[in-house]
Amino acid sequence: KSPIFGPQEVSSIEGDSVSITCYYPDTSVNRHTRKYWCRQGASGMCTTLISSNGYLSKEYSGRANLINFPENNTFVINIEQLTQDDTGSYKCGLGTSNRGLSFDVSLEVSQVPELPSDTHVYTKDIGRNVTIECPFKRENAPSKKSLCKKTNQSCELVIDSTEKVNPSYIGRAKLFMKGTDLTVFYVNISHLTHNDAGLYICQAGEGPSADKKNVDLQVLAPEPELLYKDLRSSVTFECDLGREVANEAKYLCRMNKETCDVIINTLGKRDPDFEGRILITPKDDNGRFSVLITGLRKEDAGHYQCGAHSSGLPQEGWPIQTWQLFVNEESTIPNRRSVVKGVTGGSVAIACPYNPKESSSLKYWCRWEGDGNGHCPVLVGTQAQVQEEYEGRLALFDQPGNGTYTVILNQLTTEDAGFYWCLTNGDSRWRTTIELQVAEATREPNLEVTPQNATAVLGETFTVSCHYPCKFYSQEKYWCKWSNKGCHILPSHDEGARQSSVSCDQSSQLVSMTLNPVSKEDEGWYWCGVKQGQTYGETTAIYIAVEERTRGSSHVNPTDANARAKVALEEEVVDSSISEKENKAIPNPGPFANEREIQNVGDQAQENRASGDAGSADGQSRSSSSKHHHHHH
């Protein structure tokens, strides 16, 4: 299927001009390659009329041009002084020959309709209303006023001043006069439909002295706006229907042959195909609203219509707006898993793509909720603190520059199952949807922390160990201290990774973290996790409570605990003379450093893991190390 997209049908009248926009995929080659507009002949050959190489055919000389808009990935063909000879089949395309990627466009140029010379033309959109002005002479002021619609032979009454109304105009037509002006009457027709189009005559008086005026009413279907979107990206339908329908229910539907199937409306209806990836947002009191769809699929391509009616369904004679959505399968958005599976008590690491050109954009993760019009409250973000109910179990890791950030959620429950969105404050096309499925755990977790009831005593040494299975042997293990701004990775290195081993003892693989001496700031959530390069894997969480020596070992409620802590960890105890100031200068404080420092995080993690020379003025130290016991046979 060609990734070029444009208007399928273009219609105009003689003497007018048209502007045809064609879309192409966002690649450097496409931006700079030849663009063309050609006319298809009976033989199937397509004769170039204009191209971006500067070619202009004789028949287009002085009346056409082709402009490339590389920043929008579009090119536009403007043709003026149209004649009926321009009616035909055309292609807009890309490539060195006219057999390249292209899109078929049908252009129809019709004659200007011949109307009586004094005819007043009103052009209105479907669903809108028209007020027809009917002037008359003063002597016809007392006479009957009327508006009729011309049919083949006669003129069928619409409304008159004796309050006679054609049944098909009841509730839609009214005849009135303004103020004291006795030389003009008005007829207003609302909820216009295609059937209302045609020639009308308004009349005041009877016989030869009657005042008559010819009116041509044109009722137009709105021109569909073209939307060119990448597979897996998102689209927003901005619907502006006007103040007159501000209080009506709104809907978005997709054309399906003769009907328009509602996808979503403000009365709570939603197509199951769009579950988890659609929101409808009323914008203001002027009848404006928008519908956002993420995770676009190729089957989402088609003709969409928005409208307003108390039923929340399409209704003839009510204002609409239309779009033609094209889904480009040559997507720049990477193909990621759209369903992530986890188990109760376990964890998931979700890789969220973002536009690599916008590495400094703010990253967010929100949970889609379908109640009402649907909404997606942010749970975590690069500058947004973790929501309270996710304390200790949710963090966002931004890997600057590589087009991916990771969201980790652990201590999973079945209530976490649902739809989540990855989004940034930058390129909105890169909003993606993930469905999280959570099954009941049927086996022990891969990562286990001991001791499980972790209460550390102030001033003493406290060690927690994280046991991992052999399958994680080659992966990097880490501990991090969680705060509502993220999980600061604690520098460590894996002793066992440097040793050669023949076998792996399932029971003895562990990575330990030592707090020495324990301080009050150490209280909070800690995570043990595995990762391979920038790809995060499983995690498990433990809450470490801190008590004074004198007190018993009563458990501190994790949600009441202060989760903020210093992050200054190393593998072994270091000289206590290292000052606090020096300590702060250590690079890579973790992925949730303040914005000023975050630029330096980049590739220093590797360097940091090896050095482990941080300390603090009061002689505290933290250590994190891996121990492997090898059995040689």
Epitope: R31, H32, K35, I50, S52, N53, G54, L56, S61, G62, A64, N65, L66, I67, N68, F69, P70, E71, N78
Partner: nanobody, 127 residues
Framework: QVQLVESGGGLVQAGGSLRLSCAAS????????MVWLRQAPGKEREVVAA????????SYADSVKGRFTISRDNANVRVYLQMTGLKPEDTAIYYC????????????????????WGQGTLVTVSS
Amino acid sequence: QVQLVESGGGLVQAGGSLRLSCAASGRSFSSYNMVWLRQAPGKEREVVAAVTWSGGGTSYADSVKGRFTISRDNANVRVYLQMTGLKPEDTAIYYCAATQDWYGGSRAFRAASFHSWGQGTLVTVSS
């Protein structure tokens, strides 16, 4: 294709004004967006100003915004560059060129493909 010939360059004192003109021949002048570029000795060629085919849209380099004005006359197949408040750093050879590309900002025109160039006109601004 269009053939282009620039004129109007010369020596002017800082703060002074000049009007450059570019005469085009060829039947398709009105089909093109027109661009004024300049090249100072030892520097890269840069787009100074651009105007759309109809004259309805313009784009300027930050360094000349508010001082230079580009316009076109499709009937007389000409494009103009009105330069005021000239500075010594405006000294360069000025070229006009035709393109079918249109960018939002003049800097992006570096990637544009230009179909026709003039031979250039020298503007010297003395301090």
